[in-house]
Interface confidence: low
């Protein structure tokens, strides 16, 4: 058992344009309270299925009276916590939703008008006994901030309130194989007892009293042996004597869901997904309307002005599914370029960029040369987040750095020898031919093919290549 | 109630690394609602924001443009604290730090949490 | 080097209103939530307004803050001597990916 709490911080206009109208004015003051639903697991369920977890409504806020042309600030909120307590243990998956109402206290007749001015959801994984939860959410042009935690009742601790605590016995340690109580250290962890005769290698108990089975073991003490071979019906009682598990009758048998909704069972019972128009346990009330405010997060409903008729939710950006309900998960859109990691952090999507990028979006492709010296005359070149070396003739490497062998591709065209020189290459030419790689044949008559031969070089001689 | 407790050098040689740590009290440093800042003040620049971390699943940072290339804001998880690493330091790196806590008030970028300081003065 | 202006001094008598102004652009306060902080003389930044106009607990309530547009302002009611101190406003930029604060107001408490 315990308690699950939540803390209005703020309730006013989101920030961008658009602020929304003060919900108060001078000739109409109001006041606001909330309401919280809670519903356990992340199941994609109705808004309008019960708050099986537990609901809670707050008190009432300070009256508030709008001024002429003022915009809307955050208005005035109700003290202390919504506090929602559960009797089981705590599920560790939940779904909630908050409604924001505003009550009118003009002169009405019959008393103040209530109204619901905005309705957040959301799913969330939440350990019991953590710190307290943040959270940030966006219902149309107004913005709700808020805190929630789930805390276990004495005596029971643990993530899901489910281990038991009670005063240590002896100021320095626990009974054996009992630990102490983390967070109360001066408190042992209270063995749990299950049901008389309850198998203790086969069966165990979250509760005082209960006697549940591991897989492969059945009984009201876990003590006989799961067989599927000899079963034969589909559905039926249970045999002890075969020592056959054969289930009962299901809670979604014969569909207990109307008007089209789906069955899917639940641990405890069984949960109706009703169509649009339909809500209730069963999907047995019909005529939800754009009157009921369906549209969560700041939907825009549209049509269903009267019961037989179907509304339409347009979700803001950010939300989908037929109430709006489910948050998009914008990170899915992948807005992040060139390999950048996506975080959602809810107030606003942050790009962690790769090396050799930048930008709220890893736009920006940096200068991958700035800072990067090539050696001995290298060029640097730009790609790919990556920088490469033009490295000048007789070097290599990544930066130049390295002396390369100029011989190596047999630069020395018909039969040339080629000489290492410090400042390149030079080539020997076979009788024939000259040039500085030994490209040009001599004509038999000694005229070269080359205009005329630099002066004081014979055919034949070496020929530097600079 | 929460406090953060700085320590380190108070003078570094200029090119050097400066190092300081921030010992957290009273909150997480893995909390998953708040994020852990380091920043600076001086004449010359006034406050300016240096870097956070924060761990959401998993550890995530935030670099300020104008130190991105020399700055290392790491959380150790086993002594609760922060840690600052400035490299290549300048005499323009000479300023008071402080390291700070946000987030907690649903804003990840109010600051109500703040370390007493430390003068660092870079000179050889 | 700040990208946040503020006015360098403010002054006024005890009991006064003093207000401090606070000019960004689209990129920080135009689009996220301006925050103010208040620094005494020798000790570190507090936090005295976040979300625009929220008041952590235990700051006076005669201080109060609001945004417009790309500006935001900070005003102190019923100015009193220990409000003496620097102010600076804050927010995160989204062009910049970071958090920048503004260039700071001295506000002295004639006497």
């Known amino acids: 058992a315990g308690v699950f709490e939540l803390q209005i911080h703020s309730f006013g206009p989101g920030p961008g344009p658009g602020a929304p109208r003060s919900p108060c004015s001078a000739r109409l003051p109001c006041r606001l309270f909330f309401r919280v639903c809670l519903k356990p697991g992340l199941s994609e369920e109705a808004a309008e299925s019960p708050c099986a977890l537990g609901a809670a409504l707050s008190a009432r806020g300070p009256v508030y009276t709008e001024q002429p042309g003022a915009p809307a600030p955050d208005l005035p909120l109700p003290d202390g916590l919504l506090q929602v307590p559960f009797r089981d243990a705590w599920p560790g998956t939940f779904s909630f939703i908050i409604e924001t109402w505003r009550e009118e206290l003009g002169d009405q007749i019959g008393g103040p008008a209530w109204s619901l001015l905005a309705r957040v959801a959301g799913r969330r994984r939440l350990a019991a006994g953590g710190p307290w939860a943040r959270d940030i959410q966006r219902a149309g042009a107004w913005e709700l901030r808020f805190s929630y935690r789930a805390r276990c009742e004495p005596p029971a601790v643990g993530t899901a309130c489910t281990r038991l605590c009670r005063p240590r016995s002896a100021p320095s340690r626990c009974g054996p194989g009992l630990r102490p109580c983390a967070p109360l250290e001066d408190e042992c962890e209270a063995p749990l007892v299950c049901r008389a005769g309850c198998s203790p290698e086969h069966g165990f108990c979250e509760q005082p009293g209960e006697c549940r089975c591991l897989e492969g073991w059945t009984g009201p003490l876990c003590t006989v042996p799961v067989s599927t071979s000899s079963c034969l019906s589909p559905r039926g009682p249970s045999s002890a004597t075969t020592g056959c598990l054969v289930p009962g009758p299901g809670p979604c048998d014969g569909n207990p869901c109307a008007n089209g909704g789906s069955c899917s069972e639940t641990p405890r019972s069984f949960e109706c997904t009703c169509p649009r128009g339909f809500y209730g346990l069963r999907c047995e009330v019909s005529g939800v309307t754009c009157a009921d405010g369906p549209c969560f997060n700041g939907g825009l409903c549209v049509g269903g002005a009267d019961p037989d008729s179907a509304y339409i939710c347009h979700c803001p950006p950010g939300f989908q599914g037929s109430n709006c309900e489910k948050r998009v998960d914008r990170c899915s859109l992948q807005p992040c370029r060139n390999g950048g990691l996506c975080l959602d952090l809810g107030h606003a999507l942050r790009c962690r960029c790769r090396a050799g990028f930048a930008g709220p979006r890893c736009e920006h492709d940096l200068d991958d040369c700035a800072g990067r010296a090539c050696a001995n005359g290298g060029t640097c070149v730009e790609g790919g987040g990556a920088h490469r070396c033009s490295c000048a003739l007789g070097f290599g490497g990544r930066d130049c750095r390295e002396r390369a062998d100029p011989c190596a591709a047999r630069p020395c065209a018909h039969g040339g020898r080629c000489y290492a020189h410090f400042s390149g290459l030079v080539c020997a030419c076979a009788p024939g031919y000259m040039g500085a790689r030994c490209e040009f044949p001599v004509h038999p008559d000694g005229a070269s093919a080359l205009p005329a031969a630099p002066p004081g070089l014979r055919p034949g001689d070496p020929q530097r290549y600079l | 109630q929460v406090q953060l407790q700085q320590s380190g050098p108070g003078l570094v040689k200029p090119s050097q690394t400066l190092s300081l740590a921030c010992a957290i009290s009273g909150d997480s440093v893995s909390s998953n609602s708040a994020i852990w800042n380091w920043i600076r003040q001086s004449p010359s620049r006034g406050l300016e924001w240096l870097g956070g971390?924060?761990?959401?699943?998993?550890?995530?940072?935030d670099y300020a443009v104008s130190v991105k290339s020399r700055i290392t804001i790491n959380p150790d998880t086993s002594k609760n604290q922060l840690s600052l690493q400035l490299n290549s330091v300048t005499p323009e790196d000479t300023a008071v730090y402080y390291c700070?806590?946000?987030?907690?008030?649903?804003?990840?970028?109010?600051?109500?949490?703040w370390g007493q300081g430390t003068m660092v003065t870079v000179s050889s | 080097q700040s990208v946040l202006t503020q006015p360098p001094s403010a002054s006024g008598t005890p009991g006064q209103r003093v207000t401090i102004s606070c000019s960004g652009s689209?990129?920080?306060?135009?689009?996220?939530?301006a925050n103010w902080y208040q620094q005494l003389p020798g000790t570190a930044p507090r936090l005295l307004i976040y979300?625009?106009?929220q008041r952590p607990s235990g700051v006076p309530d005669r201080f109060s803050g609001s945004k417009s547009g790309t500006s935001a302002s900070l005003a102190i009611s019923g100015l009193q001597s220990e409000d003496e101190a620097d102010y600076y406003c804050?927010?995160?930029?989204?062009?910049?990916?970071?958090?920048?604060f503004g260039t700071g107001t001295k506000v002295t408490v004639l006497t």
């Open positions: 804050a927010a995160w930029d989204d062009s910049l990916n970071g958090y920048v």
């Open positions: 700070s806590r946000g987030g907690i008030v649903g804003v990840p970028d109010a600051f109500d949490i």
């Open positions: 689209s990129s920080n306060i135009g689009s996220n939530t």
């Open positions: 979300r625009n106009n």
């Open positions: 971390t924060y761990y959401r699943s998993m550890w995530y940072n």
